[in-house]
């Protein structure tokens, strides 16, 4: 879809003029969230040197962030629509606690962080409608999420900066993989 005023052009998909289909609406919605993540990453990178750290250096962390793997059926090789859709929804549900953690982590982009969180909730609803016949979707335990949130918020400043950076990077990668896969459905 062409970039609309106020949207970032990271979302280019090709010109489009007709009314949007539900697939195109989901596509546009994910690209909107990706733009929000981009803005949050900018603030994070300006605030700390985490963005200069190599992926390897940051890999040694105890965060259990959702990640796409071959077995999830979301990649071009071995693509499986049902398996992949379950993975996308499950992953987004798991990311919700991390997006809650991000809410108090931004100064100038506080509204952007809220927009990313709320848009993700809407995206989950869109996708749950799409997957109404799939029953393999597990929702994280509220008590588990609450204790995880407490642990994350109790970290020292440096670890909180690293956690913020890792959440944004992982969420961006997860959404990009989801966007590519959903275009095949």
């Amino acid at each position: 879809a062409p970039v609309l005023p106020g949207e970032d052009s990271k979302d280019v998909a090709a010109p489009h003029s007709q009314p949007l289909t539900s697939s195109e609406r989901i596509d546009k919605h994910i690209r909107y969230i990706l733009d929000g993540i981009s803005a949050l990453r900018k603030e994070t990178c300006n605030r700390s040197n985490m963005c200069e750290s190599s992926k390897e250096a940051l890999a040694e962390n105890n965060l259990n962030l959702p990640k796409m793997a071959e077995k999830d059926g979301c990649f071009q090789s071995g693509f499986n629509e049902d398996t992949c859709l379950v993975k996308i929804i499950t992953g987004l549900l798991e990311f919700e606690v991390y997006l809650e953690y991000l809410q108090n982590r931004f100064e100038s982009s506080e509204e952007q962080a809220r927009a990313v969180q709320m848009s993700t909730k809407v995206l989950i609803q869109f996708l749950q409608k799409k997957a109404k016949n799939l029953d393999a979707i597990t929702t994280p335990e509220p008590t588990t999420n609450a204790s995880l949130l407490t642990k994350l918020q109790a970290q020292n400043q440096w670890l909180q900066d690293m956690t913020t950076h890792l959440i944004l990077r992982s969420f961006k990668e997860f959404l990009q993989s989801s966007l590519r896969a959903l275009r095949q459905m």
Partner: antibody, heavy 122, light 109 residues
Framework: EVQLVESGPGLVKPSQTLSLTCTVS??????????WSWIRQPPGKGLEWMGV???????YYSPSLKSRTSISRDTSKNQFSLQLSSVTPEDTAVYYC??????????????WGKGTLVTVSS | QAGLTQPSALSVTLGQTAKITCQGG??????AHWYQQKPGQAPVLVIY???SRPSGIPERFSGSSSGGRATLTISGAQAEDEGDYYC???????????FGGGTHLTVLG
């Protein structure tokens, strides 16, 4: 495996219209989120993007060529075409057609034709 | 439309790392893609969406993008990596593609 093949006259006279067709096999030109571009490369120079036709038939052109360029498609033949009017010797180039796949989020092009050389000369 | 700026030529010793940069206003908000082109052949996509590698492209090719600058890195350059490399992105409207001027990579030794 997607294949793209360019075809058309190798020689065009100045002021005439250059017409090229790209025939696609192994994939449909109407597949959601795919887009089909024309790119050219003058001898010894770099690549220049000319325009695109998206899966829904909408088009967009390079601002510098917009007034002379038209891209259309024939879905029954799985082909898309380029027309460049009022050509001059500066339009002499290898012309490529290429696909932007739905597996790419941005405007990258993952499949290209081999290219066809078009010379503009009287 | 504003183009993308690349160094016109770069030399690297066999087995060493080559870094080709690409700069331009639209790169801050558009994905970068990289193509390799050998004489008489069509371009081949080696990196897409800033940092993704198509299947069949060797692992020594990697990409990154930050701000208005994208980088293609070839770790342990091989003789067969010699050729022209083009970066490409979308313009600020998001509807038109834009190419860099190309970088000729020479592998020495």
């Amino acid at each position: 495996e997607v294949q793209l093949v360019e075809s058309g006259p190798g020689l065009v006279k100045p002021s005439q219209t250059l017409s090229l067709t790209c025939t696609v096999s192994g994939g449909s030109i109407t597949a959601s989120f795919d887009a089909w571009s024309w790119i050219r490369q003058p001898p010894g120079k770099g690549l220049e993007w000319m325009g695109v036709i998206a899966y829904d038939g909408s088009t967009y052109y390079s601002p510098s060529l917009k007034s002379r360029t038209s891209i259309s498609r024939d879905t029954s033949k799985n082909q898309f075409s380029l027309q460049l009017s009022s050509v001059t010797p500066e339009d002499t180039a290898v012309y490529y057609c290429a696909r932007k796949s739905s597996w790419l989020i941005g405007y990258g092009m993952d499949y290209w034709g081999k290219g066809t050389l078009v010379t503009v000369s009287s | 439309q504003a183009g993308l700026t690349q160094p016109s030529a770069l030399s690297v010793t066999l087995g060493q790392t080559a870094k080709i940069t690409c700069q331009g206003g639209s790169l801050g908000s558009s994905y970068a893609h990289w193509y390799q082109q050998k004489p008489g052949q069509a371009p081949v996509l080696v990196i897409y969406d800033d940092d993704s590698r198509p299947s069949g492209i060797p692992e020594r090719f990697s990409g990154s993008s930050s701000g208005g600058r994208a980088t293609l890195t070839i770790s342990g350059a091989q003789a067969e990596d010699e050729g022209d490399y083009y970066c490409q992105s979308a313009d600020s409207s998001g509807n038109a593609a834009v190419f860099g001027g190309g970088t000729h990579l020479t592998v020495l030794g």
